[in-house]
């Protein structure tokens, strides 16, 4: 019951945080202009992995999509395959414990097969996780380096008579939409592992030993139960959940009453 | 078609107090305060988000100025308070639009401080 | 604050002539999200609110006549009228659309010659 439970939970956790990193990864606000002293601004920039937007004072936000790939950073490349291989890993280890749960019946699958099923979505889940909180930690720290670098340089111009301010940036939600999806992918993935331990029926069987009673002539024999899992390969005394398989580029947008500035 | 009247104009004595009303038909999403002294160019006093009452003001104004809004009565208001000489002006309000600019204008209504 | 500076204050034209006003901007203006410059132009006459023109620097407001042009970047921006009408003496103003607080240039009046 245990490891249906872990397995259940894994799965779930591993759910929401595959479905996390999915939004993470289309979010626009990876990172977001800076306001610092000033938190009403005529024009606010913040940028995705795939586009960058501008939200004006006067309700209206203009996108643009980055319609080149030889043009941008190696960086930004390499986020973006992270989390594409991250959702990747994450989707087709999704499928595979589907199959895995111990909650769904196929045919006659054996305990082993989910075993071996849950642990190879376990270990997807886990390098999914791994890949997408990389991605993040990989663009906050181009985002770190990129603030600094423009705070050194806040203020460039021509005798210090026309000032250009430079657009600083800070961490976006997707940051940490991308962290917590990771962490909780990785977390499910770890649980699917542990529940795989709990399916997989130990190699070795006790031999038959009779036991005489004494004054009786009654032998007992255990009938080669598999040690300590409780869920042997016997199928006389092996439960079976029989009931039945359960299914558990430029865009304008017009202001709305939902766009803060 | 965005309609903007403004009203609540008139004299009133330094150190006085006035509210402007600007009554708003259409679809705003933030909207502007602008005044012109007469003879004089134009002079940004404040902008509002309709929806979320968020402020913000010109340094000149911070303090004495306050803009609002009636979301039940689609309605702008600029209170202005310790009036003095120099406010003497034509008060506008404008909605603003793409690019930060202000497409629509009400009429103005002429404040004038003076004993 | 930016402060915003018009040339010529006022100058003196004839029907059909290409005026020419310069407006500058003591910081650039020039969004680097979008690559647009937010600065914009109005028209006023005698007694009348102000009229949008041009905003992003060069984008013309609907229903403003294409004789209108804008152009310009980062501290420098120009509106030029290529052939001025009879309803073109009018009073433009520059205004900084970029960051709060918005500030308008002093104007320049264009007058009939």
């Known amino acids: 019951m245990a490891v249906t439970a872990c397995q259940g939970l894994g799965f779930v956790v591993s759910l929401i945080g595959i479905a996390g990193i999915i939004a993470a990864t289309c979010m626009d606000q990876w990172s977001t202009q800076d306001l610092y002293n000033n938190p009403v601004t005529a024009v606010f920039n913040y940028q995705g992995l795939w586009r960058s937007c501008v939200r004006e004072s006067s309700g209206f936000t203009e996108c643009r999509g980055y319609f080149t790939l030889l043009g941008l950073p190696a960086m930004l490349q390499a986020v973006r395959a992270l989390m594409i291989v991250g959702i990747v890993l994450g989707a087709i280890g999704l499928l595979v414990s589907i199959f895995a749960l111990k909650c769904i019946r196929i045919g006659s699958m054996e305990d082993s097969a989910k075993a071996n099923m849950t642990l190879t979505s376990g270990i997807m889940f886990i390098v999914s996780g791994l890949c997408a909180i990389a991605g993040v930690s990989v663009f906050a720290n181009m985002l770190v380096t990129n603030f600094w670098m423009s705070t050194a340089n806040m203020y460039t111009g021509m005798g210090g008579m026309v000032q250009t301010v430079q657009t600083r940036y800070t961490f976006g939600a997707a940051l940490f939409v991308g962290w917590v999806a990771g962490g909780l992918t990785l977390i499910g993935g770890v649980m699917m592992c542990i529940a795989c331990r709990g399916l997989a029926p130990e190699e070795t069987n006790y031999k038959a030993v009779s036991y005489h009673a004494s004054g009786h002539s009654v032998a007992y024999k255990p009938g080669g139960f598999k040690a300590s899992t409780g869920f042997g390969s016997n199928t006389k005394n092996k439960k079976i959940y029989d009931g039945g398989a359960r299914t558990e580029d430029e865009v304008q947008s017009y202001p709305s009453k939902h766009d803060y500035v | 078609e965005v309609q903007l009247v403004e009203s609540g104009g008139g004299l009133v004595q330094p150190g006085g107090s006035l509210r402007l009303s600007c009554a708003v038909s259409?679809?705003?999403?933030?909207m502007n305060w602008v005044r012109q002294a007469p003879g004089k160019g134009l002079e940004w006093v404040a902008w509002?988000?309709?929806?979320?009452?968020?402020?913000t003001y010109a340094d000149d104004f911070k303090g004495r100025f306050t803009i609002s809004r009636d979301d039940s009565k689609n309605t702008l208001y600029l209170q202005m308070n310790s009036l003095r000489a120099e406010d003497t002006a034509v008060y506008y309000c404008?909605?603003?639009?793409?690019?930060?600019?202000?497409?629509?204008w009400g009429q103005g209504t002429l404040v004038t401080v003076s004993s | 604050d930016i402060q915003m500076t018009q040339s010529p204050s006022s100058l003196s034209a004839s029907v059909g002539d290409r005026v020419t006003i310069t407006c500058k901007s003591s910081q650039s203006l020039l969004n680097s999200g979008n690559q647009k410059s937010y600065l914009t132009w109005y028209q006023q006459k005698p007694g009348k609110a102000p009229k949008l023109l041009i905003y992003w620097a060069s984008t013309l407001e609907s229903g403003v006549p294409s004789r209108f042009s804008g152009s310009g970047s980062g501290t420098d921006y120009t509106l030029t009228i290529s052939s001025l009408q009879p309803e073109d003496f009018a009073t433009y103003y520059c205004q900084n659309a970029y960051s709060f607080p918005f500030t308008f240039g002093q104007g320049t009046k264009v007058e009939i010659k």
């Open positions: 259409g679809y705003t999403f933030s």
């Open positions: 404008a909605r603003a639009s793409r690019g930060n600019g202000m497409d629509y």
């Open positions: 509002i988000n309709m929806y979320t009452g968020e402020p």
